[in-house]
């Protein structure tokens, strides 16, 4: 079989959902001594960036200026050392958001509510679309789909204080384009008293984990990675 | 706003040479990323040569050896130097930028690039 190196990791800095005009950047992160990464979007060659010096750093980052819904999709990355070139990462989905029109989120039957009562959120957009999504903030991979001609409803179940929080909705023209968001409604959720305190499910800042994580190598490093691979060879 | 103007084209026997040019308007010059698509008739528009702002390049297989993409930020003018033309080579030669952008990303799709020229028509006939 033909040798490959390790995949890389792809990642949307700040945020995969992108207005539209505004500028995405996309980490993909490799390896040390990578002289060559690509980026493909829906399969096809979309960029190339060659790292200076290459034993020095160990990812790129790619900028996408000027957002928009021909840019929207799903983008991979791998990166080359000598003539090696690496599996391919995962797939990352790149969103274009502020298409078109504003939806208007509500919830049933109020945004205070305790816990275990039955809680939905209707999500409604005048304009020509059938898919929709509710996202909560901080948590925006955690997308829910749901279906309707103008609105269509997100049923949460009985709640617990697990589900507060502020939430939006968008309507979405594909998988890719999505509307400008709702105003948020912020969920309150009394009850569960030993559960009251912020959650990790809370988080002050949004989508903490969607930065890249791209480091320089130093003499230190170095000096780890040689020790590190003659101790492996002196396993072996 | 970004305005790409080309010229340079016109026709060439087989193995002859041609330069194009592409001139840029505005002060952005400096941070585009610059790139050379051809669409020959009736076919898809393609991706030839691209330069980053540093000065990487990078060519499609087709034209690898043959052509040479360089950039004059004094001038506001990007080149594409052709040598070794071949009939298969006859096609509408298009300018491309993107503006801005940081790093020293190429960028090689038709997606990425926000500003485009009129295109300028090369033909290679005996």
């Known amino acids: 079989p033909k040798q490959t190196l390790p995949k890389p990791i792809i990642r949307a800095e700040s945020t995969y959902m992108v207005p539209k005009e505004k500028q995405a950047t996309l980490c993909c992160q490799g390896s040390y001594g990578a002289v060559e990464y690509q980026l493909h979007f829906e399969g096809s060659l979309f960029a190339v960036e060659r790292p200076k010096p290459p034993e020095r750093i160990n990812g790129v980052k790619f900028h996408i200026p000027d957002m928009n819904s021909r840019k929207a999709g799903r983008y991979s990355c791998i990166y080359r050392v000598g003539e090696l070139w690496s599996e391919r990462s995962d797939l990352l989905d790149l969103v274009v958001t502020e298409m078109y029109d504003t939806p208007t989120l509500s919830v049933h039957p109020g945004p205070e509510v305790t816990s275990g009562e039955k809680v939905t959120f209707y999500c409604r957009l005048d304009t020509a679309t059938s898919m929709f999504l509710l996202l909560k903030e901080g948590r925006s991979r955690d997308v829910q789909r749901s279906y309707g001609k103008v609105q269509a409803e997100f049923p949460m179940g009985p709640v617990t204080t697990a589900h507060r929080g502020s939430y939006r909705c968008f309507g979405s023209y594909n998988n890719y384009a999505w509307s400008f968001p709702s105003e948020p409604v912020k969920l309150l959720v009394t009850g569960d008293i030993e559960n009251t305190s912020l959650a990790p499910t809370d988080p002050t800042f949004p989508d903490s984990w969607d930065t890249c994580l791209l480091t320089r190598e130093t003499g230190l490093q170095k000096d780890l990675a040689l020790w590190d691979h003659t101790a492996q060879n002196l396993l072996r | 706003e970004v305005q790409l103007v080309e010229s340079g084209g016109g026709e060439v026997q087989p193995g002859g040479s041609l330069r194009l040019s592409c001139a840029a308007s505005?002060?952005?010059?400096?941070?585009?990323?610059m790139g050379w698509f051809r669409q020959a008739p009736g076919k898809e528009r393609e991706f030839v040569a691209a330069?980053?702002?540093?000065?990487?390049?990078y060519y499609a297989d087709s034209v690898k050896g043959r052509f040479t993409i360089s950039r004059d930020n004094a001038k506001n003018t990007v080149y594409l130097q052709m040598s070794s033309l071949r009939a298969e080579d006859t096609a509408v030669y298009y300018c491309?930028?993107?503006?801005?952008?940081?790093?020293?990303?190429?960028?090689?799709?038709?997606?990425?690039?926000?500003?485009w020229g009129q295109g300028t028509l090369v033909t290679v006939k005996p």
């Open positions: 491309a930028a993107v503006v801005p952008t940081y790093g020293n990303n190429i960028y090689v799709h038709s997606a990425a690039y926000n500003y």
């Open positions: 505005g002060r952005t010059f400096a941070s585009a990323a």
């Open positions: 330069i980053s702002r540093s000065d990487d390049t």
